[in-house]
Structure formats: structure tokens, C-alpha cells
């Protein structure tokens, strides 16, 4: 019994004065607590407690279930204890079969012994199966067997407490360990689509998938900058013991423009949190926006190729696309395709391939596209650059020499005089009259220029050159003059092409 200094309150004393007492089943348990300030006896086993206000605890016929810790407490709150084993060969274990463990923590298999003198107190697997190799335990006859550092792999492990009694192995009732996994990473969250574009009145539905080791992961849909509780529907699955998946589906049955915004799927566990967002844009009606990828005014050289390219945004998706020129629809030479294969793609590309363009093929090329809500169009003005062509070169009755040339861009006509037989005409002659004529051809076709000079200025034999040129090239026509007496005659005109 403990000894204390005089004057200080002392713990009660218990008879018999030993820490452990072994009695046989059916025998009497008689425990006496001596203390002037006696309050109560308390009996504890397997988390169950009983009290007795008598200072003598008497159990006439002891049973195995009377095994446990008997504590006497006085008015000062001081106490003393004795542990009683009631030896019963037919009931070697007291058991509480409820067995839970947390991963990486210790857990107690509650199977205290009724006889401390049995040997080899340990754990065994059910049905003769071995225990996991890494399972470590510490036996305590008064409490049970402590499994150290529970592993996830021990979940639903079936086991018995075991002792050797008179050379034979005796097993307790079965226990099945239920393990709660430790969260060692944040939940994995993903969303069905990163962005949604809807028309007013359409249904918005988005699904967040949450994956974790346990169903106790918390998840919710939140609207950014809003506290409103959103309506969610759930579907969940256990793919084995520690592979849990939940789908949280958020639905707005009839979306409005003011529902537009960012929605966040948030999940957390004891390790940390994770989130993923999706953007909703609700428009009052559909739209088409066209973006030319080249300038809408196009200059191309005669015989060359050009691609007219547009990108366009269309929502809802485009239903009809066409390219038109001179009120005629192209049936081929063009292609239309989505900018990306992404499910939420609203951007498309259309390309018209014009090959070996002729001077007569300039004009307005129009791309038209429509969906169920709107139509849209864009026009390209295509100009075909052509080298000048001299259409006419004549000596008029009034003595004028006239040269008419066509080309694009608008040709310039210069006049030169070559005296005698010289090949090079260097002396320039100023025209009397220059006019740009209206072409009878299509718009964007060649421009026609007429230029005249007065032939009376020429007093000697020679050649007059009419040279028409632009950025693309040049062409010349020639007038030959010969004087017979006082008469001037025009000899046949001819043209030369100078590249």
C-alpha cells in the first residue's frame, strides 16, 4: 500500500493488498476498501463500468465476466485499484468484437484474458490463414492486443485472439478489423467540360468527378462570388475498398443570361482541398461572328492562285455555308471545317481555293453562313492584276494617232518618236488627250485608257511608239511614217511586246 506524509490526504487502502488477484470461477470475490472518506467502488472492463457505494465489494459466485479493474475512490478524489482475474477454463477471453482502426494508428483488439497464467497470448488469422507479414502487435492480458500502425491492407482482416492452455491453442471469437484510410493526397477532381455556351432557356448540366480513398471526402458545387446553395445530384461508386468515385451533377433547368459566370467544383479531405472550374455563358440568342484571315481586298496576278480564308464563331452550330461569285454558288473548290475537335468548339474555318485566276475572274466573292438563329456574310473584292493589252491603235481622220490599252492596275500610255531607222525611240511625245474609259466588262475587270497625239508634229520619216505599262508588264504598238513629197502616209502599224 502507498505511504504518505502525515497531514496529507492519502489514497484508500484495499484488502487484499496486491495489484492482481486471481480467483476461480464460482469462488467469492471479497474486496475491502478502507478509508475514512470512502466514496465508491468502480468496476471497469471493456469500457463498461459499474459502481458500488458499499466499502466492501462482494461477489458470491464469481464469473469470468467479473474479471476487470476494481477501483476504490475517496472524497479527495484519490484512488487505489486491484485487478481481478476470474479464471474460467471455458471462457478464457472477454471480448468486445467491435474493431475499428485508422490507417497508421494503433488499434486495440479487445480480448482481455480471464487467466493471466496462460501462455503465448497472440493474434491468429481466421480459417488457418496467416496474418500479414508486417502486422505487429503487443499483448496486454488486462486490455487485449494492440495492433501497431494499422495498414490499409488490413481492412476487413479476420482474426482471433489466441492463447496456449495446457499445450493446446485456444481461439477467441472472430474479429473483423475495419480500417479507415488516411488521406495522403488531396482529392482528384475533374469536370465534364471547361466551358459551356447556351441560349437562354436551355438546360445547363455539368458533372464534376471526385476521386478519393474514402466516401467521407467532402464535395460541393459553388458559384464564384455567391453563397447560394446549388442543387446537385450525386452518383457514387466504390471500385474496391479504397477507390471511391463520386459524380456531382449541377443542373439549371432553364438557364438565364444572369446565370452566366464561373462555377467551381470544390472537394476537400483532411489532407487538403482541390477545385476545378467551368464557365457558363448564356446568350439571349445565337450569333455568328466572321473574321477574315486575309485582307478583304485582294490583289492577285493573272494566272496565279489565291485562297480566301475566313474563321467564324457560330452558336448554335452552323447549318449552311456557301461561297458565291456573280450570283453563282461554288459547288467545289472550298472546304469548311471546325477549328478544333473540342466538344465545346464554336470556331470554324472556311477556305475558297481560287486557281490560275484570269483577268475576267476579278470581282466580289461572298461567304455566307447561317445557323438556326442568324445569317452572316463577308465579301472579298478580288482584283486580278493583268499586263496591259493594246486594244486599238489608229490614225484618225483628223490626223490624230490614238492608242487604247486595257489592263489592271490602270495602264499608263507613253508616246515616243524614233526618227529615221533608229531602233530606240527615246524622244518622248506629250499626248494631246488622255481618257479613262468605262469598261463594258464586269466590275473589278481591266481598266481601259485612251491616249491621243497629234501626228502633224512629225516632219520626218520615222516610227511612233505607243507604250502601255503598269506594275505587271508593258506592251507597245508602232506607227511608221514616210513622206512622199508633201504627203505623209501611215505605213502599217505593228505591236511589239516588251516584257
Amino acid at each position: 500500500q502507498p505511504s504518505v506524509s502525515p497531514g496529507e490526504p492519502s489514497p484508500p487502502s484495499i484488502h487484499p493488498g496486491k495489484s492482481d488477484l486471481i480467483v476461480r470461477v464460482g469462488d467469492e470475490i471479497r474486496l475491502l476498501c478502507t478509508d475514512p472518506g470512502f466514496v465508491k467502488w468502480t468496476f471497469e472492463i471493456l469500457d463498461e463500468t459499474n459502481e458500488n457505494k458499499q466499502n466492501e465489494w462482494i461477489t458470491e459466485k464469481a464469473e469470468a465476466t467479473n474479471t476487470g479493474k476494481y477501483t476504490c475512490t475517496n472524497k479527495h478524489g484519490l484512488s487505489n485499484s486491484i485487478y481481478v482475474f476470474v479464471r474460467d477454463p471455458a471462457k478464457l477471453f472477454l471480448v468486445d468484437r467491435s474493431l475499428y482502426g485508422k490507417e497508421d494508428n494503433d488499434t486495440l483488439v479487445r480480448c482481455p484474458l480471464t487467466d493471466p497464467e496462460v501462455t503465448n497470448y497472440s493474434l491468429k488469422g481466421c480459417q488457418g490463414k496467416p496474418l500479414p507479414k508486417d502486422l505487429r502487435f503487443i499483448p496486454d492480458p488486462k486490455a487485449g492486443i494492440m495492433i501497431k500502425s494499422v495498414k490499409r491492407a488490413y481492412h476487413r482482416l479476420c482474426l482471433h485472439c489466441s492463447v496456449d492452455q495446457e499445450g493446446k491453442s485456444v481461439l477467441s471469437e472472430k474479429f473483423i478489423l475495419k480500417v479507415r484510410p488516411a488521406f495522403k493526397a488531396v482529392p482528384v477532381v475533374s469536370v465534364s467540360k471547361a466551358s459551356y455556351l447556351l441560349r437562354e432557356g436551355e438546360e445547363f448540366t455539368v458533372t464534376c468527378t471526385i476521386k478519393d480513398v474514402s466516401s467521407s471526402v467532402y464535395s460541393t458545387w459553388k458559384r464564384e462570388n455567391s453563397q447560394t446553395k446549388l442543387q446537385e445530384k450525386y452518383n457514387s461508386w466504390h471500385h474496391g475498398d479504397f477507390n471511391y468515385e463520386r459524380q456531382a451533377t449541377l443542373t439549371i433547368s432553364s438557364a438565364r443570361v444572369n446565370d452566366s459566370g464561373v462555377f467551381m467544383c470544390y472537394a476537400n479531405n483532411t489532407f487538403g482541398s482541390a477545385n476545378v472550374t467551368t464557365t457558363l455563358e448564356v446568350v439571349d440568342k445565337g450569333f455568328i461572328n466572321i473574321f477574315p484571315m486575309i485582307n478583304t481586298t485582294v490583289f492577285v496576278n493573272d494566272g496565279e492562285n489565291v485562297d480566301l480564308i475566313v474563321e467564324y464563331e457560330a452558336f448554335p452550330k452552323p447549318e449552311h455555308q456557301q461561297w458565291i461569285y456573280m450570283n453563282r454558288t461554288f459547288t467545289d473548290k472550298w472546304e469548311d471545317y471546325p477549328k478544333s475537335e473540342n466538344e465545346s468548339n464554336i470556331r470554324y474555318v472556311s477556305e475558297l481555293h481560287l486557281t490560275r485566276l484570269k483577268g475576267t475572274e476579278g470581282g466580289t466573292y461572298t461567304f455566307l453562313v447561317s445557323n438556326s438563329d442568324v445569317n452572316a456574310a463577308i465579301a472579298f473584292n478580288v482584283y486580278v492584276n493583268t499586263k496591259p493589252e493594246i486594244l486599238t491603235y489608229d490614225r484618225l481622220v483628223n490626223g490624230m494617232l490614238q492608242c487604247v490599252a486595257a489592263g489592271f492596275p490602270e495602264p499608263t500610255i507613253d508616246w515616243y518618236f524614233c526618227p529615221g531607222t533608229e531602233q530606240r525611240c527615246s524622244a518622248s511625245v506629250l499626248p494631246v488627250d488622255v481618257q479613262t474609259l468605262n469598261s463594258s466588262g464586269p466590275p473589278f475587270g481591266k481598266l481601259v485608257v485612251q491616249s491621243s497625239i497629234d501626228s502633224s508634229a512629225f516632219k520626218h520619216n520615222g516610227t511612233v511608239e505607243c507604250k502601255a505599262y503598269n506594275d505587271v508588264g508593258k506592251t507597245s504598238a508602232y506607227f511608221n511614217f514616210a513622206f512622199k513629197g508633201n504627203n505623209k502616209e501611215q505605213i502599217h502599224p505593228h505591236t511589239l511586246f516588251t516584257p
Partner: antibody, heavy 118, light 111 residues
Framework: QVQLVESGGGVVQPGRSLRLSCAAS????????MHWVRQAPGKGLEWVAV????????DYTDSVRGRFTISRDNSKNTLYLQMNSLRAEDTAVYYC???????????WGQGTTVTVSS | DIVMTQSPLSLPVTPGEPASISCRSS???????????LDWYLQKPGQSPQLLIY???NRASGVPDRFSGSGSGTDFTLKISRVEAEDVGVYYC????????FGQGTRLEIK
């Protein structure tokens, strides 16, 4: 004696809340996982929610997740089910049940009736 | 979720005769620990359910030995060797391998 007694049921309008209680006696409540199971009129049994012995682990059937909350007070030997945003389809007799060592329900309360009606 | 399907849904039996109820699961209920997480319950008229069989074949405390459970994986059977009048009620199978689900119930009645 060993028993579970539910209370807190009643008639409630859709969208409103109700809290059910389950008082345990005759056993060490804090050592057991506890469940709620319901039974709609004339229908079969449907599991609703579970809570571990210490309150750390909880799970719910998908149809009540986010609306119902299971909790326990081991010092009062009482299990609770907080039911928010109630719907007509939540109308049922609600039973609390104790989970034994083999994860079976070895003890059931007598049930409490919840009627959700406008 | 694992779907539990019971048959028959109604079972009229003469007292003293045997009875058998089948329960099939949409996936195996056999855990790596060797146990089938399949339980049987009886709900007598006007009463709460009571546990009859746990882990596929183990009789619960106080359950008469005329009740027996068998089967493994996805196919399970509850047998009553000789039906008595007090056995009337609805029998449910329940899986506890994953999120708990019940069968739709089999009503046993006396002919």
C-alpha cells in the same frame, strides 16, 4: 435492456427541415457504427446513412447526400439525422440500426415516421 | 451500386413445408478475407427488421436453426427447413460489401 428508440418524426412541408434522434441504451454506444435505414410506405428497405463509432467517417446514399447530415453525441448515447430540403420522396419510416462486428445490423429501433406533404 | 435481385417476390407456403428464397447480386460479394458480405433480414408484420443470417451463412444469435444461409459470389439462398406460422413476413437480402443495398423483398405467407 439493450435498445434503440427513434424520435422526431412528423409531418412537414416540402423544402422544410426535421431532426431525428435515436437514443441508445444497454450497450456501449461509443463502440459501434450506426446507420439510418428508411422504408417508404408499402416499399422495401433503403439504406440512408452511416457514421463510425467516433463520428469521423460518414457516408450517405446518393439521393440524400448534401441534404441530410448524420451525427452522434457519444456522451448522450444518441444518434441524429438532420434532414434539410425535404422532398415528398423522403416520406418513410426511419429506423436507426447498430452495425455489429460483421457489418450486419444486429439491432434496430422501432422506427419513426416522416411524412413530407404540402 | 450493387443491385440485389430477390426471387420469388411472393412465397405461399404450407406450415411444416420447406421454403427457399434466392438472392442474386450484380457483382461478387466475396471479399478477399474469404467472407461473403451478404445478410438476411426478416421484417414481421408491423415490426422492425431483425437479423437472421450474416456473412452469407452465419446464423445470428437467437435465430432458430431451421433458418440457414448458403451461397457465394453472386448467388445466395435462404432456406427454412420447416416453415412455422411465426415466420410470416418480408425477407430481405442485403449486401454490405460496398454502399449498402437491399433486395426488393420476398413476402412469405401461409397457405
Amino acid at each position: 435492456q439493450v435498445q434503440l428508440v427513434e424520435s422526431g418524426g412528423g409531418v412537414v412541408q416540402p423544402g422544410r427541415s426535421l431532426r431525428l434522434s435515436c437514443a441508445a441504451s444497454g450497450f456501449t454506444f461509443s463502440r459501434y457504427g450506426m446507420h439510418w435505414v428508411r422504408q417508404a410506405p408499402g416499399k422495401g428497405l433503403e439504406w440512408v446513412a452511416v457514421i463510425w463509432y467516433d463520428g469521423t467517417n460518414k457516408d450517405y446514399t446518393d439521393s440524400v447526400r448534401g441534404r441530410f447530415t448524420i451525427s452522434r453525441d457519444n456522451s448522450k448515447n444518441t444518434l441524429y439525422l438532420q434532414m434539410n430540403s425535404l422532398r415528398a420522396e423522403d416520406t418513410a419510416v426511419y429506423y436507426c440500426a447498430r452495425e455489429d462486428w460483421a457489418e450486419a445490423f444486429d439491432m434496430w429501433g422501432q422506427g419513426t415516421t416522416v411524412t413530407v406533404s404540402s | 451500386d450493387i443491385v440485389m435481385t430477390q426471387s420469388p417476390l411472393s412465397l405461399p407456403v404450407t406450415p411444416g413445408e420447406p421454403a427457399s428464397i434466392s438472392c442474386r447480386s450484380s457483382q461478387s460479394l466475396l471479399h478477399s478475407n474469404g467472407y461473403n458480405y451478404l445478410d438476411w433480414y426478416l421484417q414481421k408484420p408491423g415490426q422492425s427488421p431483425q437479423l437472421l443470417i450474416y456473412l452469407g451463412s452465419n446464423r445470428a444469435s437467437g435465430v432458430p436453426d431451421r433458418f440457414s444461409g448458403s451461397g457465394s459470389g453472386t448467388d445466395f439462398t435462404l432456406k427454412i427447413s420447416r416453415v412455422e406460422a411465426e415466420d410470416v413476413g418480408v425477407y430481405y437480402c442485403m449486401q454490405a460489401l460496398q454502399t449498402i443495398t437491399f433486395g426488393q423483398g420476398t413476402r412469405l405467407e401461409i397457405k
